[in-house]
Interface confidence: medium
């Protein structure tokens, strides 16, 4: 039987096949893929902008930042307001004070410790 390079197409991940000779083909890959048959997802993480300890997670022609608990946003640059998230973060009447990358408690009436529980 006659071999036709692009029938069926060897290109994967949405790549488009183009016959370049009697027995040869070329795959035109969609953005984010590479390889002779578009089989590889290009790692976008070498170019990441994740901040504040955020971890880059590769996607297709993009990436996402997995942020530590204290940070949020596309690049982990927005401070999480722990005082809003945890209304009882400070015990015994202590006042919660949000800070960049964390929070602190201002204790009253002789209480002490990170959460005014001592």
């Amino acid at each position: 039987s006659l071999y036709v390079p692009c029938a069926p197409s060897p290109c994967v991940n949405g790549g488009t096949c183009r016959q370049t000779g009697d027995f040869t083909f070329e795959c035109n890959c969609l953005p984010g893929f590479e390889g002779s048959t578009c089989e590889r997802n290009i790692d976008d993480c070498p170019n990441h902008r994740c901040q504040n300890g955020g971890v880059c997670v590769d996607g297709v022609n993009t990436y996402n930042c997995r942020c530590p608990p204290q940070w949020t946003g596309q690049f982990c640059t927005e401070d999480v307001d722990e005082c809003l998230l945890q209304p009882n973060a400070c015990q015994n009447g202590g006042t919660c004070a949000n800070r960049n990358g964390g929070y602190g408690c201002v204790c009253v009436n002789g209480w002490s410790g990170d959460d005014c529980s001592e």
């Epitope: 953005p31 590479e34 290009i42 790692d43 993480c45 070498p46 170019n47 990441h48 902008r49 901040q51 880059c56 022609n61 993009t62 946003g73 596309q74 690049f75 640059t77």
Partner: antibody, heavy 117, light 110 residues
């Protein structure tokens, strides 16, 4: 399109601010606004970039740190402040929009800065 | 900063011929490399991005290859209009690699 302005003839030691104005688009996430210069008859030299998103990350060539400052002054303008200019800073200064993800780069025509006594 | 070393500084070739320009990065830049064409009195024009992706409107006679530290730009079926200076450029952010250009290669057509 992009257009640079502010190029001038100045004396050594002077300061100068260049402005890059975008037409037809406003700054948003996904690309950088950059400054590149080219001395007469010489090659291209990268100066600095600022991320167009709200985070405004800035990146500088090591030789440019301290003497050059890139900033976004509005959603359509980027400035480059230059201090302590020397004769070696004489060049055409280009503003460019860069992205590595889809190749949609855009350059202005350039503005000439001449430093001479 | 990453240092981009481009060779040769100049090359002469005939119409219909092929030219290959090499670019070496001082550290791995993955595939974050662009190639530009510049003619006198004009800003640079993007030809290739991500080492091998053809920019919009650029003829397929231009092709880019490589990753890591070694890259090439090949121009085949040379035309008179290809006479220009060509630059490679790293364009990554993760390790502050941004922006470094090679010294340029002047292509002259015989």
């Amino acid at each position: 399109s992009l257009e640079e302005s502010g190029g001038d003839l100045v004396k050594p030691g002077a300061s100068l601010t260049l402005t890059c104005t975008a037409s037809g688009f406003s700054f948003s996430s996904g690309y950088d606004m950059c400054w590149v210069r080219q001395a007469p008859g010489k090659g291209l030299e990268w100066i600095a970039c600022i991320y167009a998103g709200s985070e405004g990350f800035t990146y500088y060539a090591s030789w440019a740190k301290g003497r050059f400052t890139i900033s976004k002054s509005s959603s359509t303008t980027v400035t480059l402040q230059m201090t302590s200019l020397t004769v070696a800073d004489t060049a055409t200064y280009f503003c460019a929009r860069w992205t590595d993800s889809d190749g949609s780069n855009l350059w202005g025509p350039g503005t000439l800065v001449t430093v001479s006594s | 900063d990453v240092v981009m070393t481009q060779t040769p500084a100049s090359v002469e070739a005939a119409v219909g011929g092929t030219v290959t320009i090499k670019c070496q990065a001082s550290q791995s830049i993955s595939s974050y490399l662009a190639w530009y064409q510049q003619k006198p009195g004009q800003p640079p024009k993007l030809l290739i991005y991500r080492a091998s992706k053809l920019a919009s409107g650029v003829p397929s006679r231009f092709s880019g290859r490589g990753s890591g530290t070694q890259f090439t730009l090949t121009i085949s079926d040379l035309e008179c209009a290809d006479a220009a200076t060509y630059y490679c450029q790293s364009n990554s952010y993760g390790n502050n690699w941004v922006g470094g250009f090679g010294g340029g290669t002047k292509v002259e057509i015989k």
